[in-house]
């Protein structure tokens, strides 16, 4: 009821709490002398379900049978309507529609740690839509019983606040949960367990790792556990991995030797505990320990390549390049690279430590047989040296790979293909494919890239340090013993028409013809490999089509003669450049008038 109503009453039969689907009878009745003045039969009683009129009747009382009420609370309000006045509220009542509790399912209890308290969880089943009280009961040996009630509406957890002790680990305890509301009650099936069944150890703590003699092969993991722990699970993984290595150990007593860790690797370690081989549950995983394993001396050998450049009649420049060892080969922080250069006949040797670079350039005499050895060193030692005899890589013409081609292969990849050399192809021990950005000045500072290919391969996909719209000079070397042959080609992964034409910087007259000189197009405007230059000319003030001369592109060329101009005629000249994608816009225009006599 709303509370004591002065004007009348609303009663609900059989009860104001009903089972879903039940029917109720609602009666609204006026108290004496509370109706409309003058005529009691003018009393009009109206029954509202919340704000919706569901029934009315003239007189002192109204009966209404109501069905189909939804789960939850429905408010009924009775009002009185008299002639020439507003409706006035007489009284009201709520009807609560719900269901009896279902049997709680999957009751399970746990004690976290040997010093923890027993707590149980269960599944309530469907909502009752009514206040439902849960009572948890635990009975143990010697007729001991404990009981706890839950006042929360969505109760599915209770902590008894009692601690089971290991004095008699095999003693049986039985738990049961009972749900009660206004429409009924239901109890779970009993759950029977022992101390060993329900105690879940606390996760191990104070985890440490020690490496004897700073060696990864002599590693021990230490931790602390609760006193009764019998089993441990260890899991560990490199910090950048998602897969765990798992180890199960019995009676470890807080230590375990790990034998398969990789050097110079950050690992994550976690440990879990259990009290009994087949009873109870594993603890949560411990907090992670992160630790880096010690370095070991590098394994593997450096991939070394070189370039020779003629300086003068007696000297040559040698540039050595090498690739970083992989993390698994370096097995530590590489502190320096050791380069040894030796003249093989005279025995002279020089050694140098290189830090912070993976290249080294020196000048040596053109005479003699030279060899280099390069190794990588970390705090524990050095890798095996890679030895290379310095030779003329392109000297053996018969070893030159044939029909070299370079084609774009998707985004930022170039597929290089070739045919084996004419000389016995079985003599080839390996191919090396080398590429570097094409710079018209032949800049030796441009980074060099290379990859090695087996002797039976006739193609290689190059993708490292390949940028769109850049032209690369690509060489394929065939190596056989102390001989080498090479072929070269230009290639790009993506191209479009150059952004500008060459800039004519001079036109000079020579014996009745002219020599045109130009500046190279800046590399960033070439937009790929140039194939041709075109020189255009036409008579000034003429509307005729210009004549043109097409010159194959050569890296170093920046002048060209034209001998088809008429003397004493003023011409306008300009140039364009072409890639496979098309022709650039005009470069600058220059006027020129040939002074010489006509041929």
């Amino acid at each position: 009821k709303i509370d004591a109503c002065k004007r009348g009453d609303v009663t609900v039969k059989p009860s104001h709490v009903i089972l879903l689907g039940s029917t109720v009878n609602i009666t609204c009745s006026l108290k004496p002398r509370q109706g409309c003045f003058h005529y009691s039969r003018r009393n009009k009683l109206i029954l509202y379900k919340f704000d919706r009129r569901i029934n009315f009747h003239h007189g002192h009382s109204l009966n209404s049978q109501v069905t189909g009420l939804p789960l939850g609370t429905t408010l009924f309000v009775c009002k009185l309507a008299c002639i020439n006045s507003d409706e006035i509220q007489i009284c009201g009542a709520e009807i609560f529609v719900g269901v009896a509790p279902e049997q709680p399912q999957n009751l399970s209890c746990i004690q976290k740690g040997e010093q923890g308290t027993v707590a149980c969880t269960w599944e309530r089943g469907r909502d009752t839509h009514l206040y439902t009280e849960y009572t948890l009961q635990l009975s143990g040996p010697k007729n001991l019983t404990w009981q706890k009630q839950c006042k929360d509406i969505y109760c599915d957890y209770l902590d008894f606040g009692i601690n089971l002790t290991p004095e008699s680990p095999e003693s049986n305890f039985t738990a049961k949960v009972t749900a009660v509301n206004s429409l009924g009650s239901s109890s779970s099936l009993p759950s029977t367990f022992t101390f060993l069944d329900i105690v879940r150890p606390l996760p191990p703590w104070d985890i440490r790792i020690k490496f004897q003699k700073a060696s990864v092969s002599r590693c021990t993991l230490y931790w602390r556990d609760e006193g009764l722990v019998l089993l441990n699970r260890l899991r560990y993984r490199p910090s950048n991995s998602r897969l765990w290595n798992m180890v199960n150990v019995t009676k470890a007593k807080g230590r375990h030797d790990l034998l398969d860790l990789k050097p110079f690797t950050e690992y994550e370690f976690q440990i879990s505990s259990k009290l009994h081989l087949y009873k109870g549950s594993w603890s949560d995983w411990s907090e992670s320990l992160r630790a880096q394993t010690p370095e070991e001396e590098p394994t593997g050998m450096l991939d070394v390549w070189y370039m020779k450049r003629h300086i003068d009649y007696s000297r040559q420049q040698i540039s050595l390049f090498w690739k970083n060892l992989s993390v698994s080969e370096a097995r530590g922080k590489i502190l320096h690279y050791q380069v040894t250069l030796q003249e093989l006949t005279g025995g002279k040797a020089m050694t140098q430590n290189i830090t912070g670079h993976t290249s080294w350039t020196t000048v040596i005499p053109r005479t003699g047989n030279w060899a280099v050895a390069v190794s990588a060193a970390n705090s524990k030692g050095s890798s095996l040296p890679t030895r290379i005899n310095i030779m003329n890589l392109c000297e053996a013409g018969l070893l030159a790979p044939r029909q070299v081609s370079a084609n774009s292969e998707g985004m930022d990849n170039i597929l290089v293909t070739w045919q084996p050399p004419r000389k016995d192809p079985s003599a080839v021990q390996e191919y090396v494919v080398e590429w570097r950005e094409l710079h018209p000045g032949g800049d030796t500072q441009v980074p060099l890239n290379w990859l090695r290919s087996r002797p039976y391969n006739v193609s290689a996909l190059i993708s490292e340090n390949i940028k769109s719209y850049i032209c690369y000079e690509i060489r394929v070397y065939a190596l056989s013993g102390d001989q080498g042959g090479c072929s070269s080609i230009l290639g790009n992964s993506k191209h479009k028409a150059p952004l500008s034409g060459p800039h004519i910087n001079a036109i000079t007259e020579e014996k009745g013809s002219i020599l045109i000189s130009w500046n190279s197009i800046p590399v960033q405007e070439q937009m790929g490999c140039l194939l041709h230059y075109r020189i255009y000319w036409k008579e000034r003030d003429s509307n005729s089509q210009p004549q043109l001369c097409e010159i194959p592109y050569r890296v170093s060329q920046n002048s060209h003669p034209i001998n088809s101009l008429q003397p004493r005629v003023t011409y306008v000249l300009w140039m364009t450049a072409l890639t496979a994608a098309g022709e650039s816009s005009h470069g600058n225009e220059r006027e020129f008038c040939l002074q010489g006599k006509a041929n």
Epitope: I2, D3, G72, T73, E94, H129, L130, I153, S182
Partner: nanobody
């Protein structure tokens, strides 16, 4: 045990607005309706608006179109936004939570509409 505390009442001019709040202690309120009632001097307490546990609002005829009831189950609070107030709305406004074990009422907050 559920306790209810109303707030937000005051003096307002005709045509003005007020927002009443009622905060409950005890999480059981989330499965029940929350209601607003009012009692004018010399009159009986009358129902104004209800909101179900799932958020469906209902209004008495005098409140329909001017008042809006809402609830925030996380904060265990029900609100009544009252617009276009008239002198006839002057009353003490009470918050109520009906349960099958009995009704819980707040102490009320005074709303006075006067120029």
């Amino acid at each position: 045990q559920v306790q209810l505390q109303e707030s937000g009442g005051g003096l307002v001019q005709p045509g003005g607005s007020l927002r009443l709040s009622c905060t409950a202690s005890g999480s059981i309120v989330s499965i029940y309706n929350m209601d607003w009632y009012r009692q004018a001097p010399g009159n009986e307490r009358e129902w104004v608006a209800s909101i179900t546990s799932s958020g469906d609002p209902y209004y008495d005829g005098s409140a329909k179109g001017r008042f809006t009831i809402s609830r925030d189950n996380a904060k265990m609070t029900v609100y009544l936004q009252m617009n276009s107030l008239e002198p006839e709305d002057t009353a003490v406004y009470f918050c109520k939570v009906p349960t099958e074990k009995g009704n819980y009422w707040g102490q009320g907050t005074q709303v006075t509409v006067s120029s």
